[in-house]
Interface confidence: low
């Protein structure tokens, strides 16, 4: 969250890959997992403007990806977010880290793979029931975030094909007994529990039987909290921008967060020549806050009219929750109209702080 | 949950120096600024300035610059507040404050105290 | 140093609504939407009650609201309760001193 002004050229940038770096990090992932990659700036320099590649394609933020200028969070990863991530320059395109990324299907969550554990025949005649994959079995206690798949699995075999049910403390399970349901996928042997809550803690138990007996396994699920942060802020909103005088402008700011978040606009301003106050912290003035009658949707855009070259300068969205604060800024440039054309053929639209 | 917990009572002589630690748990120390705020027998409130213990800067109220240092342990996560060439008037309960400010953040004038510790009481008396 | 003038003392029976002014400047009160109150019991550390002029934190009852009309800041207490009874103390953002309080007001419960 650099307060320094970014320079930044919108249009196209010249490819010129940088050396890649000596080392490249492998890591593994479980399937749910989030995944972080952490990019320092080289020498604890600035950085500058930065852009993060996966398998040559640069990311696009959403709500499972939130990209910042030296941190990428992939939450809920699976299968699909393997590969080959990098943080580039934007301007250069120069490679500033590197990482091989594997997501792993972990026992405790994730797809299930179409097909596999199947029951089987086994060409045995008659026969009580066996673990097919007990190696698959190991992981008796399993802690996961809250929101994440949770998947057991009980592999077995046996002749005749024998059944599976489920148990939770010792007592039937069935999908009407959790907010959300529960999948029984007795061709692989699994339950599957999609956005797990506190209250899905407990054990839980397969119980494999045919005519010949009976086997069973049981797990233990702990549900980890999410640990409370302050808001996160999309990266690259708000956007900086460049309009003609008189025109109409709007902000964008994208606010994600579990406690209730309180989103402000600001400008800045200068008092008596001074950019900043005597506790040395930038003078303001609060553009739009969050009123009776206002809502969150509203408050992520900051709707310019007719804009004066008084309003051009640097703009801040800022929100904070009950553990603290973020903010992002960005700069309006405003040209005389007749100059509009010409700086965008010429520059492709240069932002210049 | 949060918990500042300050250093025991002091009894000084004028012209002595005093320091008190405030202890911080259950949450990240090094992400809020901490204040400190003292009280009077029978007076109001009366802020003192704050510490980024993030980054160990400091900003002192303009009354008690050159006679008070605030510093920080982030190994132990813990502030303190000295106060030197103490007078009788500078008998007071002395409290850190955190305030709900990230020390990533820089708009400082939204300051809102959040979490107290429970107080040290400082008799300057010869 | 008393930079934000408050009434020393309020007083209200239970049940009644009760309002405590904080007076400054426009460099102050005036100037910024950065009004809070806290309330402290004796021997107690205050609690923050009310923040930006009129939000509450969570927790804090909804009989305790603030407003600001000019460089005067107001908390009001409905519905009052012995719990109440405390020393309540205003603080704002200052533009030359950065944070200053109020004196004070002591509040009594008949």
């Known amino acids: 969250e650099s307060l320094g002004t970014e320079q930044r050229v919108v249009g196209r940038a010249a490819e010129v890959p940088g050396p890649e770096p000596g080392q490249q990090e492998q890591l593994v992932f479980g399937s749910g997992d989030a995944v972080e990659l952490s990019c320092p700036p080289p020498g604890g320099g600035p950085m500058g403007p930065t852009v993060w590649v996966k398998d040559g394609t640069g990311l696009v933020p959403s709500e499972r990806v939130l990209v910042g200028p030296q941190r990428l969070q992939v939450l809920n990863a699976s299968h699909e977010d393997s590969g080959a991530y990098s943080c580039r320059q934007r301007l250069t395109q120069r490679v500033l880290c590197h990482f091989s990324v594997r997501v792993t299907d972990a026992p405790s969550s994730g797809d299930d793979e179409d097909g596999e554990d199947e029951a089987e025949d086994t060409g045995v005649d008659t026969g009580a029931p066996y673990w097919t994959r007990p190696e698959r079995m190991d992981k008796k206690l399993l802690a996961v975030p809250a929101a994440n798949t949770v998947r057991f699995r009980c592999p077995a075999a046996g002749n005749p094909t024998p059944s599976i049910s489920w148990l939770k403390n010792g007592r039937e399970f069935r999908g009407e007994h959790r907010i959300g349901g529960i999948k029984l996928r007795h061709q692989q042997w699994s339950l599957v529990m999609e956005s797990v809550v506190p209250s899905d803690r407990g054990n839980y138990t397969c119980v494999v039987e045919n005519k010949f007996g009976s086997i069973r396994q049981t797990y233990t699920l702990d549900v980890l909290e999410r640990s409370p942060h302050r808001p996160i802020l999309q990266a690259g909103l708000p956007a900086n921008q460049t309009a003609v005088l008189g025109s109409d402008v709007e902000f964008h700011c994208k606010v994600y967060s579990d406690a209730q978040p309180h989103i402000q606009w600001l400008k800045h301003v200068e008092v008596n020549g001074s950019k900043v106050g005597p506790d040395g912290t930038p003078y303001v003035t609060v553009l739009k806050t969050a009123g009776a009658n206002t809502t969150d949707k509203e408050l992520e855009v900051l709707s310019l009219h007719n804009v004066t070259f008084e309003d051009a300068g640097e703009y801040t969205c800022l929100a904070g929750n009950s553990i603290g604060f973020s903010h992002h800024s960005a700069w309006l440039v405003v040209l005389p109209a007749e100059e509009e054309l010409v700086e965008a053929d010429e520059a492709g639209s240069v932002y210049a702080g | 949950q949060v918990q500042l917990v300050q250093s025991g009572a002091e009894v000084k002589k004028p012209g002595a120096s005093v320091k008190v630690s405030c202890k911080a748990s259950g949450y990240t120390f090094t992400s809020y600024y901490m204040h400190w705020v003292r009280q009077a027998p029978g007076q109001g409130l009366e802020w003192m300035g704050w510490i980024n213990p993030n980054s160990g800067g400091t900003n002192y109220a303009q009354k008690f610059q050159g006679r008070v240092t605030m510093t920080r342990d982030t190994s132990i996560s813990t502030a303190y507040m000295e106060l030197s060439s103490l007078r009788s008037e500078d008998t007071a309960v002395y409290y850190c404050?955190?305030?709900?400010?990230?020390?990533?953040?820089?708009?400082?004038?939204?300051?809102?105290?959040?979490?107290w510790g429970q107080g040290t009481l400082v008799t300057v008396s010869s | 140093d008393i930079a934000l003038t408050q009434p020393a003392s309020v007083s209200g029976s239970p049940g009644q609504s009760i309002t405590i002014s904080c007076t400054g400047t426009?460099?102050?009160?005036?100037?910024?939407?950065?009004v809070s109150w806290y309330q402290q019991h004796p021997g107690k550390a205050p609690k923050l009650m009310i923040y930006?002029?009129?939000n509450r934190p969570s927790g804090v009852s909804n009989r305790f609201s603030g407003s600001k009309s000019g460089n005067t800041a107001s908390l009001t207490i409905s519905g009052l309760q012995a719990e109440d009874e405390a020393d309540y103390y205003c603080q704002s953002y200052d533009m030359y001193n950065y944070i200053v309080f109020g004196g004070g007001t002591k509040l009594t419960v008949l």
């Open positions: 404050a955190r305030s709900m400010n990230s020390t990533m953040y820089w708009y400082l004038r939204r300051v809102l105290f959040d979490h």
């Open positions: 930006d002029v009129s």
């Open positions: 426009s460099s102050d009160v005036g100037g910024y939407n950065y």
